[in-house]
């Protein structure tokens, strides 16, 4: 009685059950009722990442510099090579196809948080008593001076893209 | 951005060492990290490298069985298995895949002598 | 893998050029993972070129590199007295386990 299901990592060819090839390993031949399925490794640039009968091996992705990826990790016969983004700049897919540089947060915004490989930048507006007259990627908003802590008193008022301006306190005559 | 190597010193031959690597505004989660080596007097030879994600390690034919790479968040540590006079170098740390973008520490010196 | 560069010494004059070989017995990853690197006495190495041919950051373009494949070029058009050093190419590969450098190639400048 022909079988009409395999055990895993087998699968079913002409009623018969066949040994499946390894992850790094493609179909040559199935098995008949005299041999065992043949397989041969996968070529350099090549994987597969499961247990297969594929007559092909996928080649590894390819992450171009001109798109702003960069080799986070080579791949092997059994992985697929991950992409990620060169510094200052981050992936605009979960694949990581290509890359935009990271934003900058504008004067009188603050980076919330710093972007990475995968992530934007994220920014948040400076609250009262805080300030930020740059635009970046890395700072955050800064705090007002305190004019009191140094003896001396605010002459002009702090804005969300200005700090405070101190001067002396005025002398009684 | 930096790198700084330490734990070169004198040692006697046989005697186990480990040389860490020591990384700052580096995610050692995105980059693969290797390690080269120069005799006094001669040429860069590499030694191995650790993967990014997976922490695989790769190492030169003539170095397998010589060092161990391995790493945790901020360091890269390489071990000399069983030091001999040949050993003798400076070794240094390298961020990336050889070939592409590299940064390189300022290397520390091992002396190998009975 | 084994890199073969232009034995050394190698002569230049200021103002001239130079040029260095590398040659690679196997194809390197992505056909460009070559680099070059300057190294002065006592000095850790300084990249000059990536991926073969993309100049590194702060470094002079009188450096150029080109070559795919198997067979690289270092080239140093008007030469200073500052670029005599000690060049090396280095290759990366499929397998890790086959990277390597070139032996080195000095440049005297005369």
């Known amino acids: 009685e022909p079988p009409t299901a395999c055990r895993e990592k087998q699968y079913l060819i002409n009623s018969q059950c066949c040994s499946l090839c390894q992850p790094g390993q493609k179909l040559v031949s199935d098995c008949t009722e005299f041999t065992e399925t043949e397989c041969l490794p996968c070529g350099e640039s090549e994987f597969l990442d499961t247990w297969n009968r594929e007559t092909h091996c996928h080649q590894h992705k390819y992450c171009d510099p001109n798109l702003g990826l960069r080799v986070q990790q080579k791949g092997t016969s059994e992985t697929d090579t991950i992409c990620t983004c060169e510094e200052g700049w981050h992936c605009t897919s979960e694949a990581c196809e290509s890359c935009v540089l990271h934003r900058s947060c504008s004067p009188g915004f603050g980076v919330k948080q710093i972007a990475t490989g995968v992530s934007d930048t994220i920014c948040e507006p400076c609250p009262v008593g805080f300030f930020s007259n740059v635009s970046s990627a890395f700072e955050k908003c800064h705090p007002w001076t305190s004019c009191e802590t140094k003896d001396l008193v605010v002459q002009q008022a702090g804005t969300n893209k200005t700090d405070v301006v101190c001067g002396p306190q005025d002398r009684l005559r | 951005q930096s790198l700084e190597e330490s734990g070169g010193r004198l040692v006697t031959p046989g005697t186990p060492l480990t040389l860490t690597c020591t990384v700052s505004?580096?995610?050692?989660?995105?980059?693969?990290m290797g390690w080269v080596r120069q005799a006094p007097g001669k040429g860069l030879e590499f030694i191995g490298i650790i993967t990014s994600n997976s922490g695989d390690t790769y190492y030169a034919t003539w170095a397998k069985g010589r060092f161990t790479i391995s790493k945790t968040s901020t360091t890269v540590d390489l071990k000399i298995t069983s030091p001999t006079t040949e050993d003798t170098a400076t070794y240094f740390c390298v961020r990336g895949y050889i070939g592409a973008p590299n940064l390189w520490g300022p290397g520390t010196l091992v002396t190998v002598s009975s | 893998a084994v890199l073969t560069q232009t034995p050394s010494p190698v002569s230049a004059a200021v103002g001239g050029t130079v040029s260095i070989s590398c040659q690679s017995s196997k194809t390197v990853y992505y056909n460009n993972y070559l680099s070059w690197f300057q190294q002065k006495p006592g000095q850790p190495p300084k990249e000059l070129i990536y991926y073969a041919s993309t100049l590194s950051s702060g470094v002079p373009s009188r450096f150029k590199g080109s070559g795919s494949g198997t067979q690289f070029t270092l080239t140093i058009s008007d030469v200073q007295c500052d670029d005599a050093a000690t060049y090396y190419c280095a290759g990366g590969y499929n397998s890790d386990s086959d990277n390597t450098f070139g032996g080195g190639t000095e440049v005297v400048v005369k």
């Open positions: 505004g580096i995610d050692l989660s995105r980059y693969a």
